[in-house]
Interface confidence: low
């Protein structure tokens, strides 16, 4: 039968059942994908826009695929084998009562089964297998794939190869709350904070616990992964993103044409090949660019570097450095510097560190 000819697979939740909280649906689906990624080289990432490989849909009765649902009971869900279009999609009967527990129909357990089909598995004759055609509730906290399930999926995709393991693309708690988590770049965008890492970014709305992870390419398809520095000029609705010796301008959240441009247009000397971090201070209308153990200061009004730079980071930002990964400006008086898994709240008026935090402290970890 068909299989996915790639190891990086996207999914999207088309709509949500009213039976459960949105967050619980997200969690159940994410955990169901994780069951299969744990025993294969497959990587799953949730996207919120654009075409996903696997579309998760809640629908009732006839819903446009010639496989109408039958009301409560009977067929709980169905899924299509790997392929384009409807291929891979998983449909759940909205006439069932979907739950996080043993009452009604457990979404997680059903999703594990349906995703098995989405990946190319047929039904199993082993009653202990999740791919057995009859639904039976088991304790989801101790749920394990049967040997038959694992044999089946690994016959299609092989076993997980440790050296292929990427940073967790589906934003499961261990990744986001991993105490060793570091970021490539961080910037505010209006009342949001974007945290960039590899091909992903986390989105945090100020003063809200909720965050979401997304592919950079799903928001800005023309931008590369691995953004290394970012800063915002909020008054102009502009965000600048840097990778290697190039930068992109985002205006009103839309990429501007005729980019990328060379970072040397800012006035950097030729030996500067990339920017580690950048931050704009609206009080001074200056942008600080951090490169290795030095920083430059750029006058955004006059569009030129200030004289007397570069300077050593350690000399002028007490307790910060010698190098940093990311930085952003907040609350009209703080820079937040990121160094590996540590973060420093720095009061630029007092010119000292006022707090030491973990890099992922913004996520309620």
């Amino acid at each position: 039968g068909p299989v996915w000819r790639k190891h990086y697979i996207t999914y999207r939740i088309n709509n949500y059942t009213p039976d459960m909280n949105r967050e619980d649906v997200d969690y159940a689906i994410r955990k169901a994908f994780q069951v299969w990624s744990n025993v294969t080289p497959l990587k799953f990432s949730k996207i919120n826009t654009g075409m996903a490989d696997i579309l998760v849909v809640f629908a009732r009765g006839a819903h446009g695929d010639f496989h109408a649902f039958d009301g409560k009971g009977g067929i709980l869900a169905h899924a299509f084998g790997p392929g384009s279009g409807i291929g891979g999609d998983a449909h759940f009967d909205e006439d069932e009562f979907w739950t996080t527990h043993s009452g009604g129909t457990n979404l997680f357990l059903t999703a594990v089964h349906e995703i098995g089909h989405s990946l190319g598995l047929g039904h199993s004759s082993d009653p202990k297998a999740v791919m057995f055609p009859t639904y039976k509730y088991v304790d989801i906290n101790t749920f394990r794939l049967s040997a038959d399930d694992i044999r089946g999926i690994q016959s299609l995709y092989g076993d997980p190869k440790e050296n292929q393991r990427l940073p967790n693309p589906d934003n499961s708690e261990p990744a986001l709350c991993d105490p060793n988590l570091s970021f490539d770049a961080v910037t505010t965008v209006g009342n949001k904070i974007f945290f960039f890492k590899d091909r992903f970014f986390w989105l945090k709305v100020s003063e809200r616990p909720k965050t979401s992870v997304n592919l950079i390419s799903s928001l800005w398809p023309t931008l590369p992964s691995g953004i290394e520095a970012a800063y915002e000029i909020e008054a102009r609705n502009q965000v600048f993103l840097f990778k290697d010796d190039k930068y992109w301008l985002i205006s009103n959240l839309r990429p501007e044409p005729n980019y990328p441009k060379s970072i040397h247009s800012f006035g950097f000397p030729n030996f500067v090949k990339k920017i580690d971090a950048a931050v704009f201070n609206p009080r001074f209308y200056r942008t600080y660019f951090f490169v290795d153990n030095q920083y430059w200061r750029y006058d955004e009004r006059r569009q030129m570097m200030d004289p007397g730079y570069p300077k050593l980071i350690t000399k002028n930002f007490q307790g910060i450095g010698p190098k940093i990964d990311a930085v952003f400006y907040s609350k009209n008086k703080y820079y937040y510097f990121f160094q590996g898994s540590n973060q420093f709240e720095y009061d630029f008026l007092l010119q000292r560190i006022t707090k030491t935090l973990k890099s992922n402290s913004w996520f309620g970890c």
């Epitope: 088309n14 709509n15 949500y16 949105r22 996207i47 919120n48 826009t49 849909v57 809640f58 629908a59 209006g190 009342n191 949001k192 989105l203 709305v205 100020s206 003063e207 809200r208 909720k210 979401s212 997304n214 799903s218 928001l219 909020e234 609705n237 959240l253």
Partner: antibody, heavy 125, light 108 residues
């Protein structure tokens, strides 16, 4: 050119029914959530109903819940509003509007970026 | 439900003057848009996500604010800016969407 054109308005008696249509052109209709918004004579804007791009989830203001039904036919690029048990207070200009915004960020913001010219519904005996 | 209150109800100004329109939410919101409506016309999106100008909107329009207090500023009124302005917020889950009562900017 991106365009929305409402039709189906008219004079109807209290308790009667009307079906409004909104024909979309110039954009990929099936990719956008759509809304109906109304404006009573001399009054402000009131959101009436919304529908997801797929036609799946639908949403209603409390004032019309149980009486109005929003639907869409993506193959015809058309949005509908079926209005039953009409009351005098439903008298208004009804606009259909395209929901813009990055769907990716939809938990965070949302706006109506394209509006039709409106169709007038008068409920009177 | 979140209530949106706009003030003043009417603003009488001359062309070239600065207009400051206020919108207050009964609870904290972070997804605010502003619309302009000319007499007999459909509304037009001006500002979304508090401060982002919609496509084709002149730079004299700007939005600001956070939490419960938001402002639309027109730096120097042009004749075509005399209209009614509405703010609008949306909660996504469960979906609820409310407009403010509007502010009419009229020629003094």
């Amino acid at each position: 050119e991106v365009q929305l054109l409402e039709s189906g308005g008219g004079l109807v008696q209290p308790g009667g029914s009307l079906r409004l249509s909104c024909a979309a052109s110039g954009f990929t209709f099936s990719a956008y959530e759509m809304d109906w918004v109304r404006q009573a004579p001399g009054k402000g804007l009131e959101w009436v109903s919304g529908i997801s791009s797929s036609g799946g989830p639908t949403y209603y203001a409390d004032s019309v819940k149980g009486r109005f039904t929003i639907s869409r036919d993506n193959s015809k690029n058309t949005l509908y509003l079926q209005m039953n048990s009409l009351r005098a207070e439903d008298t208004a200009v009804y606009y259909c509007a395209r929901v813009g915004g990055w769907e990716l960020l939809q938990d965070y913001y949302y706006y109506m970026d394209v509006w039709g010219k409106g169709t007038t519904v008068t409920v009177s005996s | 439900d979140i209530q949106m209150t706009q003030s003043p109800a009417t603003l009488s100004l001359s062309p070239g003057e600065r207009a400051t329109l206020s919108c207050r939410a009964s609870h904290s919101v972070d997804n605010l848009a502003w619309y302009q409506q000319q007499p007999g016309q459909a509304p037009r999106l001006l500002i979304y996500d508090v401060s982002y100008r919609a496509t084709g909107i002149p730079a004299r329009f700007s939005g600001s604010g956070s939490g419960t207090d938001f402002t639309l500023t027109i730096s120097s009124l042009e004749p075509e800016d005399f209209a009614v302005y509405y703010c609008q917020q949306r909660n996504n889950w469960p979906l609820s969407l409310t407009f403010g009562g509007g502010t009419k900017v009229e020629i003094k």
